[in-house]
Interface confidence: low
Amino acid sequence: EVEKTACPSGKKAREIDESLIFYKKWELEACVDAALLATQMDRVNAIPFTYEQLDVLKHKLDELYPQGYPESVIQHLGYLFLKMSPEDIRKWNVTSLETLKALLEVNKGHEMSPQVATLIDRFVKGRGQLDKDTLDTLTAFYPGYLCSLSPEELSSVPPSSIWAVRPQDLDTCDPRQLDVLYPKARLAFQNMNGSEYFVKIQSFLGGAPTEDLKALSQQNVSMDLATFMKLRTDAVLPLTVAEVQKLLGPHVEGLKAEERHRPVRDWILRQRQDDLDTLGLGLQGGIPNGYLVLDLSMQEALS
């Protein structure tokens, strides 16, 4: 808490300008009118205040707006935003996309902070939905933000936003999220030719159904083992040995190293051993020759 002291004669601030950087903390508290600061917030960014001075300016705004800052002030916070706590931000009602962009710009290049996460949450709640413009903005600043959304929230992500996503931004997505993102990625990249398409869609294939994996197997894509291991087990199981061989191309040899891990392990159990033997990899655990394979899943579904 800054102690209340009278402003020295001649030091009362008439406007927010560079002369204030020479003020001590107690002088800023005493000589800068909070209402003046609020109306000239846009100038603060251009002045090289110290962090300690910024603390004083924040304190003045907090006193003026105990219920939360108005958007006219929030939009011009600039690097003063970095001083805000999530508790401060929860008091705000941010509805303008320009305000959101201005504050995200301040944090650009850094990991998503608790302040930014709270800001985004407040903004989305204020708008009532994740509209296209909001998502375009959020994915431009934080492509990894997609994986922080629930599958229900992801359903309103426009395919155009997918272009901003980098492979590493999907690292934290779980299969349920990829189930939602994959059809959007397929739509976003649909006009690319086969090889370019595969490069782009590869990160999303954890949400691909069997039919699409079968189609990809006809296109000489040479999927790497890391991608194959992230595929849905239920999508991999119906693939034949020949389809997996085509899908992986030269990477098929990597199956041996992964034979004890899902989905390879479960897939091996579904294949005839003589089919597996054609790969020449020494994969074991397939259905012995001469055994009859009954698919009971359809029977269960009907009963």
Epitope: P159, K184, L187, F198, I201, Q219
Partner: nanobody, 118 residues
């Protein structure tokens, strides 16, 4: 297995209209783009309209823009091509086609003949 069956072709006078229908069955319908191609005698196949399955974005070449309209009915698993202001040069066999996104149009119907003549 994917199956596409066209109907609605026939003989029509210049300036007239026709509506072609395509019934789609199999996994393909909800996940692929659908299109209409035509092939006139002695010429190659030409795309005249396509529609994306998810967002229904449409595409038309300049030769039919403003005259042809492609549409779809998800519930009935149908794709339609409404052809207005038909010209003699529109005479061709019209094929319904389905497109796997990474591979181009790979599934075709048997075709339906459209003849524009007075």
């Amino acid at each position: 297995e994917v199956q596409l069956v066209e109907s609605g072709g026939g003989l029509v006078q210049p300036g007239g209209s026709l509506r072609l229908s395509c019934a789609a069955s199999g996994y393909i319908y909800g996940f692929y783009a659908m299109g209409w191609f035509r092939q006139a005698p002695g010429k190659g196949r030409e795309l005249v309209a396509s529609i994306n399955s998810i967002d229904s974005i449409t595409y038309y070449p300049d030769s039919v823009e403003g005259r042809f309209t492609i549409s779809r009915d998800n519930a009935k698993r149908m794709v339609y091509l409404q052809m207005n202001s038909l010209r003699a040069e529109d005479t061709a066999v019209y094929y319904c086609a389905a497109r796997y996104i990474a591979a181009g149009f790979g599934y075709w119907g048997q075709g339906t003949q459209v003849t524009v003549s007075s």
